[in-house]
Structure formats: structure tokens, C-alpha cells
């Protein structure tokens, strides 16, 4: 019992005086508390309370689940306690079977018991089965056993609170653990596309996945630099025990252009936080951007093979692609291609396959494509380099000797006068005339050229050579004259 | 003897927030886990979430994920659930119901929430 | 989650006679045979009542003509002798794994 200091309040005297009581079930419980400013009796167990503003307690016939801790409180708050056990052999426990853990937390099994006085008070499992070897516990006849440091692998494990009672294992009822993960690590998360281009009045709609160990993550989809809370749907499934998954949808059933934006997924749980964003891109109808990948302008040599190639944005998906020249549309030697497989994917390859190209195959090669929304082209210019021919050297009625070269591109004609019967010439003679013939003709064909000299300059026997040449290479054409007497005569000209 | 008291009717915009609490008494507070349940006017229960005694966890009902938070003040033995971003199906009467031995034991006398523009 | 699904969803009985609803999971709620199923009655304007817990158990208070049965999936709730106090809607309750889910209700009537 407490004792009195003078002057100062002091907690009740209760009657028994002792801390612990044990009597029998069916006898009578009364207990007495004296103080001048008694206020209450309180009885507690499994953190359940009762009052009584008697100072008397009288329970005439005890029963087990009047086992409990008697406080009495005077009206400066001061108490003191007793504790009751109500013996009964068919009701060696008072049980709250409600048992959950936190994982790496004690968690207390509530069987307090009705008789202090039987042994080896413990926790065994159910159907005979042994505990997990790492589970350690701390039992209190008042309160319960207390497991300490729960582990996930207990999760959903059966026990029982167990005593001796005359040599006789006696169990109590079923508890099954229920064990709450501890977050370990962040959530994960991912997202179905990691961007989205759509038209006006379109549906979007995306989907982020967060994995973790329980339900109790947290999630949302956050626009970036905007508060406004974005209206999702949940799926989510159990995949068996700490594995835990969450589908959130973020839906906007027609989208506007001022929806474009960057979008968060993000995930946090009490480790820490995670975030995956998507792109959106709204426009206010279809196109397409094509890109050539090669310069527009192409040259090629005669009998190569040239890849006239484009890349190029289309949406919606295109839907007709064709190469077309001179007005024909090429049936094969081409071939269309998305640039990746990807499912967002909007960029594509179109390569046409031009082999062993003739002179006469240049001019303008135009790529078409189409959508549901707009058309788009471009167009190359294909120049066939093509090595000078000589079309004709005539020795003209006014004694012009005259060349006429054709190639690509414009052939450049050099005369050459070579004394006696050699074909080395060297000595260059100036032309008189020379005229680009074609030019008002098709832009793209062989350019053709022509050239005069005076043969009256020249004054003994020899051969003139004209020569055509341009970057790709050179002929030449001879003539060959021959004075007899005053008269020069010209014989047969050559190549 | 257990007791739950919930806090009085409530009537909210759409898109409001809006927080009932739960007075407990009777017992120790932090012993017990208190869960939420509603029930929208002529329908059946349905579970919204719970906070755990001891240490304040809380696991949530799917289906309110993201407008759902239930906390809990020891030192006034009172929980609270709190449901935002509230639309017109949100109406109904909310519940506050203590955990004992595996069952629902004790349920508090509800409150109403109205959500209506 | 869990489906609890009622049957019927509502009930006309002549006083004195007997009731049975049934409530059927959509997976088991037993572990180690304990049924985390419980039953509530629900009166107008009031609260719900716990009146049998863990699949059989009455709970304090309730009369003993209430009595519950089954295991695993399928569940029943019993009024041996319907009286008229017990007109209310029925509910059952799994909490064997969250989240909890109750049964769409039963609503038991004098025929």
C-alpha cells in the first residue's frame, strides 16, 4: 500500500492489499478503495474498459473475462491498481484473435491468461506443425506474448497460445498472423508508351503499372506544372503474398491541343518515391513531313546504280506511297518502311532502287504520300552523267570544219591540228563558233554542243582532231587533209 | 463500454473535400485497428480502407485510392477519414467500426455526407 | 478482390418459421480452417449488429435462435423461428484478405 507524506495527495488504498488476486470462477469478487476524493473504478482487459462509481466493486459471481487490471482514481488523478485472475479450468485464456504484424515490429498475441499459476506459457503451431525456428517471443500472463521482430515469412501462420496445466498441454484458439510488409525499396513503375501524338477530339489514354510489396503504396498521374487533380481508374491484383500490382488509367475522352504536355506517373510508398512520364503531343489535324536523305539534286554516271532515299513523318498512319517518272508510277524497284517497330512509331523509309542508269533515264523522280488527312511530295532532279559522243564532224560548203558533241554534263570541244599523218595533236586552234544547241529543249537530257573552226587556216598536210570532253570522259574525231598543189582536199574524217 | 461517435452530417460541393471523424471511448485506443465503411443511400456496405493500431498504417480500398487518407490523433482518441475530390455517387453514410477478436464489434451511429452543386 | 456474392436478395417469411441465407465467396476465406466470414444485421436508419462471427460463433448478445454454418466458399445464416424484431436487410463479410468485402445484402421480410 501506498505511504502518506503529510500535505501531499496521495494515490487510494485498496483493499486486498496486494498487487495480484487470484479467486475462483463462481466466487465473489470485492474490492474496496479508500480515498476521501474517490472518483472511479476502472476495469481493463485486452485494452477494454469498464466503470464503476461505486467505491465498492462487487462482483458476485466472477466469471473468466472478469479477469482484469482494477484501477482505482482519485480526483487528483492519483491511482492504484489490482490485478485480478478469475481461475477457470475450461477458460484458461481470454482472447482476441485479431492479430496483425508489421514486418521488423513486435506485435503482441492477446491470450492473457485467467490462473498465473500454470507453466510454460508459450506459443506453439497449429496442427502440431513446430514454429519457425528464427521466432522469438516474450510472454505476460497479463497482456499476451509478445513475437518479437516479425518476419514476412510468417505471414498467415496459425497459432496457438499454449500452458501446462496439471502436466497437460491446454491450447488456446486460433490466431492467424497477418503480416504487413515493410517497403524495402521504392515502388517500380513503367508506363505503355512513353509518348502519344493524336488528333483533335481523339481519346487518350494511358496506363502506368506500380509493382510493390502491398496495396498501401500510393500513386497518382500528375500533369507537369499543374495542380489539377486528373481523373483515373484502378486495376489492381494480388500476385500472391508482397507481390502487389497497380494499374492506374489516365483517360481524356477527346483531347484538345492545350492537353499536350509531358504527364507523371509517380509512386511512393514510406522508402521513398518513383516516376515514369509519357509525352503527349495533340495537333489539330494530320500531316506529314518528308525529309530527303539525300540531296535532291542527284548526279549519276552513266550505267551506276543510284538509291534515291526519304524519310518521313506521317500521321495518322500513311496510307498510299508511290514513285512516280515521266508521269509512270513504278510498280517495283521501291520499297516503304517504318523506321522502327516500334508502336508510337511515326517516321517511315521509302527508297527507290534506280540500277545501271542510260543517259536518256534522267529527269525528275517524285516520291508521293498520303494520310486520311493530307498529301505530301518531293521531288529529285536525277542528272545522268553520260561521257561525250560525237554526233557529227562535217566539213562544212563554207570550209568550216564543224563538230557537234552531245553528253552530260555540257561537253567542253578542243581542236587540235596535228602536221603530217601523226594523231598526237598539240597545237590548239581557237573555234570560231561554238553553240549549246539544246538548251530550250528537256532539262534533263544529254547536252549537246557545237563547235566551228576555219579549215582555211590551215596550210599543209595534217589531221585536226576535235575533241569533246567533260568530267566523266573524252572522244575525238579526225580530219585529215591532204594539199595537192593549191588545192586542199579533205579526206575522210575518223574517229 | 465501447463507444464510437461520429461527427454530424455534412453537405459538400463536387469536387470539396470532406473529413468525419470518430470520437472512440471504452477502450485503448491504440490497441485496435479502425476501419471506414459506407453506404450510399438504398445500397449495401462497402469497405473503404483501416488504420492499424499501434503505428498508424493504413491500407485503402482500391476503388478510393488517391481520395481516401484515415488518420488518427492518440492524444484525443479520435480517428478521421477524409475523402476528396467528392462526386454526386459519394454520397451515403459513412461509418467508423472498431476491429475486435477478427469482426466489426462495435460500429459508430454514422454521418451523413450529401454532395450536391 | 474477393466477390461475396447473396442469395436471395430478399426474403418473405411467415413468422415463427424459419430463414436461410446464403453467401458464396468467390475464393476460399479459410486459412487453416478458421472462416474469416462474418454476419451483420442492418435495421433502417441504424448501424449494422454483429450477430455471428468467424462462420459459427454467436456473438454476445444475440439470440440463439441466429446461428451460422459453412466453410470455404459457401456460407449460411439461419433464423431457426423468424420473429418480427428481426425484419432488416443481412449482410455477410469476408476479412480474410483486403479488402473486405461484404455480400450485396438479403433484406429478410414478414410474409
Known amino acids: 500500500q501506498p505511504s502518506v507524506s503529510p500535505g501531499e495527495p496521495s494515490p487510494p488504498s485498496i483493499h486486498p492489499g496486494k498487487s495480484d488476486l487470484i479467486v475462483r470462477v463462481g466466487d465473489e469478487i470485492r474490492l474496496l478503495c479508500t480515498d476521501p476524493g474517490f472518483v472511479k473504478w476502472t476495469f481493463e482487459i485486452l485494452d477494454e474498459t469498464n466503470e464503476n462509481k461505486q467505491n465498492e466493486w462487487i462482483t458476485e459471481k466472477a466469471e473468466a473475462t472478469n479477469t482484469g487490471k482494477y484501477t482505482c482514481t482519485n480526483k487528483h488523478g492519483l491511482s492504484n491498481s489490482i490485478y485480478v485472475f478469475v481461475r477457470d479450468p475450461a477458460k484458461l485464456f481470454l482472447v482476441d484473435r485479431s492479430l496483425y504484424g508489421k514486418e521488423d515490429n513486435d506485435t503482441l498475441v492477446r491470450c492473457p491468461l485467467t490462473d498465473p499459476e500454470v507453466t510454460n506459457y508459450s506459443l506453439k503451431g497449429c496442427q502440431g506443425k513446430p514454429l519457425p525456428k528464427d521466432l522469438r517471443f516474450i510472454p505476460d500472463p497479463k497482456a499476451g506474448i509478445m513475437i518479437k521482430s516479425v518476419k514476412r515469412a510468417y505471414h498467415r501462420l496459425c497459432l496457438h497460445c499454449s500452458v501446462d496445466q496439471e502436466g497437460k498441454s491446454v491450447l488456446s484458439e486460433k490466431f492467424i498472423l497477418k503480416v504487413r510488409p515493410a517497403f524495402k525499396a521504392v515502388p517500380v513503375v513503367s508506363v505503355s508508351k512513353a509518348s502519344y501524338l493524336l488528333r483533335e477530339g481523339e481519346e487518350f489514354t494511358v496506363t502506368c503499372t506500380i509493382k510493390d510489396v502491398s496495396s498501401s503504396v500510393y500513386s497518382t498521374w500528375k500533369r507537369e506544372n499543374s495542380q489539377t487533380k486528373l481523373q483515373e481508374k484502378y486495376n489492381s491484383w494480388h500476385h500472391g503474398d508482397f507481390n502487389y500490382e497497380r494499374q492506374a488509367t489516365l483517360t481524356i475522352s477527346s483531347a484538345r491541343v492545350n492537353d499536350s504536355g509531358v504527364f507523371m506517373c509517380y509512386a511512393n510508398n514510406t522508402f521513398g518515391s518513383a516516376n515514369v512520364t509519357t509525352t503527349l503531343e495533340v495537333v489539330d489535324k494530320g500531316f506529314i513531313n518528308i525529309f530527303p536523305m539525300i540531296n535532291t539534286t542527284v548526279f549519276v554516271n552513266d550505267g551506276e546504280n543510284v538509291d534515291l532515299i526519304v524519310e518521313y513523318e506521317a500521321f495518322p498512319k500513311p496510307e498510299h506511297q508511290q514513285w512516280i517518272y515521266m508521269n509512270r508510277t513504278f510498280t517495283d524497284k521501291w520499297e516503304d518502311y517504318p523506321k522502327s517497330e516500334n508502336e508510337s512509331n511515326i517516321r517511315y523509309v521509302s527508297e527507290l532502287h534506280l540500277t545501271r542508269l542510260k543517259g536518256t533515264e534522267g529527269g525528275t523522280y517524285t516520291f508521293l504520300v498520303s494520310n486520311s488527312d493530307v498529301n505530301a511530295a518531293i521531288a529529285f532532279n536525277v542528272y545522268v552523267n553520260t561521257k561525250p559522243e560525237i554526233l557529227t564532224y562535217d566539213r562544212l560548203v563554207n570550209g568550216m570544219l564543224q563538230c557537234v558533241a552531245a553528253g552530260f554534263p555540257e561537253p567542253t570541244i578542243d581542236w587540235y591540228f596535228c602536221p603530217g599523218t601523226e594523231q598526237r595533236c598539240s597545237a590548239s586552234v581557237l573555234p570560231v563558233d561554238v553553240q549549246t544547241l539544246n538548251s530550250s529543249g528537256p532539262p534533263f537530257g544529254k547536252l549537246v554542243v557545237q563547235s566551228s573552226i576555219d579549215s582555211s587556216a590551215f596550210k599543209h598536210n595534217g589531221t585536226v582532231e576535235c575533241k569533246a570532253y567533260n568530267d566523266v570522259g573524252k572522244t575525238s574525231a579526225y580530219f585529215n587533209f591532204a594539199f595537192k598543189g593549191n588545192n586542199k582536199e579533205q579526206i575522210h574524217p575518223h574517229t | 463500454q465501447v463507444q464510437l461517435v461520429q461527427s454530424g452530417a455534412e453537405v459538400k460541393k463536387p469536387g470539396a473535400s470532406v473529413k468525419v471523424s470518430c470520437k472512440a471511448s471504452?477502450?485503448?485506443?491504440?490497441?485496435?485497428?479502425m476501419h471506414w465503411v459506407r453506404q450510399a443511400p438504398g445500397q449495401g456496405l462497402e469497405w473503404m480502407g483501416v488504420i492499424y493500431s499501434g503505428n498508424g498504417d493504413t491500407s485503402y480500398n482500391q476503388k478510393f485510392q488517391g481520395r481516401v487518407t484515415i488518420t488518427a490523433d492518440k492524444s484525443t482518441s479520435t480517428a478521421y477519414m477524409e475523402l476528396s475530390s467528392l462526386r454526386s455517387e459519394d454520397t451515403a453514410v459513412y461509418y467508423c467500426?472498431?476491429?475486435?477478436?477478427?469482426?466489426?464489434?462495435?460500429w459508430g451511429q454514422g454521418t451523413l455526407v450529401t454532395v450536391s452543386s | 478482390d474477393i466477390v461475396m456474392t447473396q442469395s436471395p436478395d430478399s426474403l418473405a417469411v411467415s413468422l415463427g418459421e424459419r430463414a436461410t441465407i446464403n453467401c458464396r465467396a468467390s475464393?476460399?476465406?479459410?486459412?487453416?480452417?478458421?472462416?474469416?466470414m462474418h454476419w451483420y444485421q442492418q435495421k433502417p436508419g441504424q448501424p449494422p449488429k454483429l450477430l455471428i462471427y468467424?462462420?459459427?460463433n454467436l456473438e454476445s448478445g444475440v439470440p440463439d435462435r441466429f446461428s451460422g454454418s459453412g466453410s470455404g466458399t459457401d456460407f449460411t445464416l439461419t433464423i431457426s423461428s423468424l420473429q418480427a424484431e428481426d425484419v432488416a436487410v443481412y449482410y455477410c463479410?469476408?476479412?480474410?484478405?483486403?479488402?473486405?468485402?461484404f455480400g450485396g445484402g438479403t433484406k429478410v421480410e414478414i410474409k
Open positions: 475464393e476460399s476465406v479459410d486459412i487453416y480452417g478458421q472462416s474469416f
Open positions: 467500426a472498431r476491429e475486435r477478436d477478427t469482426r466489426f464489434g462495435n
Open positions: 471504452g477502450y485503448t485506443f491504440t490497441s485496435y485497428n
Open positions: 468467424l462462420a459459427s
Open positions: 463479410q469476408q476479412n480474410n484478405e483486403d479488402p473486405y468485402t
